[in-house]
Interface confidence: low
């Protein structure tokens, strides 16, 4: 019995569902009563899911697996794995027994996009040419381990005096911190690029340092120039700092965070006390750091609706304020590709290829190209629909006349995360049946 699985690993984003494709060719007169199907972990032989005696025996793998019962009789033995975790990565074997027996293994490669790096500078005030500064680039919650590259404003790689550390959290996702020590010139731009080697996703940020003195007043409030980018569901820190004078005490401090446009109060600290969150109880200050001039605000479980500008007001004897922008983002899932019609295709046939990617933010940019990388722009219709959380599902449809054979690729780009998710389908112009989309 010939059992077919994809040669390439199946790549799945953490938290999404993955389909491990497996198919066999049923003979005429085949009935499900004859089928024994077992999915197991290739290395440990741990049972994952089975079908026997004409019945789905259910998941033996944390109740996160399912077959496609309506498709089994057509030879589709694919397995659906829900809410993928880093720990799921590895090889799964599909055993099919009717009268004969066959098996094949499919690899699951788990991935998670890295967040847009945040850049910090130490020291961050009164910089003069010739000073040594430490620039830290931090990117969060990615998998697998990242590759980190530094370069200057002219694109020249900076390799000396770089220290990079990567630490996995309890979910197995990595936080990466890369530190560059550099002696300032008259001015300079320093860029950090965090690459996910599996997703081929590049997340980058840069900082431009112009070490001309900005004369400091009693309260100079400093916030990042660039928007703070936060993934939906994660926590974001809106950085705000001031320079406390000698003898400063928290009793003198009035700190107010508010929405810049509506002036809605978000959080405050007055009369020496944290007055708490006025914003759905999802905000917090850093009380231990306030005396050092750190007035940053932590916003928990970020939602699309949080996007916008927040103003940090600091009053001691004098007064200062500055606004920081929050840009919310969510990565798009790896696109799924469907073909209509999907059987008995001939050169000259017109087919409709649909590329679907889910739950991203903000709206995506969609690009189609052929196997040679030539853009396909004609006969493309793309629609994007926001769900109740404000996340977008994108569906892009390409109508194309088949040549002898061809590859059609769809790339869904998140413009904020600079994350590219792509799917492709190769159609050979001989009579063929496109494998059913599980």
């Amino acid at each position: 019995l010939e059992v077919q699985v994809p040669e390439d690993p199946v790549v799945a984003l953490v938290g999404t569902d993955a389909t491990l494709c497996c198919s066999f060719s049923p003979e005429p007169g085949f009935s499900l009563a004859q089928l024994n199907l077992i999915w197991q972990l290739t290395d440990t032989k741990q049972l994952v899911h089975s079908f026997a005696e004409g019945q789905d025996q259910g998941s033996a793998y944390a109740n996160r697996t399912a077959l496609f019962p309506d498709l089994l009789a057509q030879g589709n033995a694919s397995l659906r794995l829900q809410r993928v975790r880093v720990a799921d990565e590895g090889s799964f074997t599909c055993f099919v027994s009717i009268r004969d027996f066959g098996s094949a293994a499919v690899s699951l490669q788990v991935a998670a996009p890295y967040s847009k790096p945040s850049m910090t500078l130490e020291p961050n005030k009164d910089l003069r040419p010739g000073d040594t500064v430490t620039i830290t680039c931090s990117s969060y919650q990615g998998y697998p381990e990242a590759e980190v590259f530094w370069q200057d404003g002219q694109g020249v790689p900076l390799t000396g005096n770089v220290t990079t550390s990567q630490m996995a959290n309890e979910q197995g996702l990595f936080d990466v911190h890369s530190i560059l020590r550099v002696v300032l010139g008259a001015n300079g731009t320093y860029s950090c690029l965090v690459r996910n080697p599996v997703l081929q996703q590049d997340a980058h940020s840069s900082v431009t340092i112009t070490p001309q003195r900005s004369p400091t007043g009693a309260v100079e409030v400093q916030v990042p120039e660039d928007p703070v980018v936060a993934l939906v569901g994660t926590d974001a820190t809106l950085r705000c700092s001031f320079s406390p004078e000698p003898g400063f005490s928290l009793a003198q401090l009035n700190l107010i965070w508010q929405l810049t446009d509506t002036k809605q109060l978000v959080h405050s600290f007055t009369e020496g006390r944290d007055q708490g969150s006025a914003y759905a109880n999802r905000t917090a200050l850093f009380p231990d750091l306030l005396a050092q001039g750190n007035a940053s605000l932590r916003l928990q479980r970020v939602r699309v609706a949080d996007e916008g500008s927040f103003t940090c007001f600091v009053s001691i004897r004098d007064f200062g304020s500055a606004a920081v922008s929050l840009q919310v983002a969510a990565p798009y899932s790896k696109p799924s590709m469907t073909l209509e019609p999907n059987k008995d295709l001939r050169p000259g046939d017109t087919v409709t290829i649909t590329c679907s990617s889910y739950r991203g933010y903000p709206e995506a940019e969609v690009f189609w190209q052929d196997g040679q990388g030539v853009p396909l722009t004609g006969n493309v219709t793309t629609s994007q629909m926001a769900n109740e959380q404000g996340l977008f599902d994108v569906h892009s449809v390409l109508r194309v006349v088949l040549g002898a054979n061809g590859t059609y690729s769809c790339l869904v780009r998140n413009p904020v995360l600079q994350q590219d998710a792509h799917g492709s389908v190769t159609i050979t112009g001989q009579p063929m049946t496109f494998p059913p989309e599980a």
């Epitope: 001309q212 009693a218 320079s243």
Partner: antibody, heavy 119, light 112 residues
Framework: QVQLVQSGSELKKPGASVKVSCKAS????????LNWVRQAPGQGLEWMGW????????TYAEDFKGRFVFSLDTSVSTAYLQISSLKAEDTAVYYC????????????WGQGTTVTVSS | DIVMTQSPLSLPVTPGEPASISCRSS???????????LHWYLQKPGQSPQLLIY???NRFSGVPDRFSGSGSGTDFTLKISRVEAEDVGVYYC?????????FGGGTKLEIK
Amino acid sequence: QVQLVQSGSELKKPGASVKVSCKASGYTFTNLGLNWVRQAPGQGLEWMGWINTAGGQPTYAEDFKGRFVFSLDTSVSTAYLQISSLKAEDTAVYYCARDDGYYYTMDYWGQGTTVTVSS
Amino acid sequence: DIVMTQSPLSLPVTPGEPASISCRSSQSLVHSNGKTYLHWYLQKPGQSPQLLIYKVSNRFSGVPDRFSGSGSGTDFTLKISRVEAEDVGVYYCSQSTHVPWTFGGGTKLEIK
């Protein structure tokens, strides 16, 4: 060598505007900030503010907010001071002075531009 | 604003004799970074001001070693060990620790 060359003297009527230029040479203009300083007749020096020549951001002392504007043309390494709605009390010598880049001082000064406001 | 007070207003000196000018600030000039941005400028008759001393005690390039600066916190002094005829003019102390930068009212040094 470093030089800051300012435009010539100006005689203006009250309510008019004047634009004083300060052309820098002998160093990279966009590496160091430029300050503006006023000296009224027989009086001391008053710091008016400064402009970041890399980014163009001006900072004004409180007494010079409103009618006074600092600007740049980096293509010709020149800074400008424009004063609008001139008053008699604006009569003074106006100096541009380079920020030294390290010690928060003004290490090189222009020769000064005398602005006289009289009806 | 920080007020800078200089004394004396006028200082007649015989060539070869020492001279001393005092400058007092209304607040400490120690910046939060620990540095003190107190400077001295000289404006010779008919000329633009020129930098003499930066950060309390450092001579600017080309300034003769007969000029020296000292002090801390709010009290500062400029000394000329042996006055020469070319030293005449108005001496200004200036602070750049706090915005706005401010100058003292000036001390006019004259030759007796």
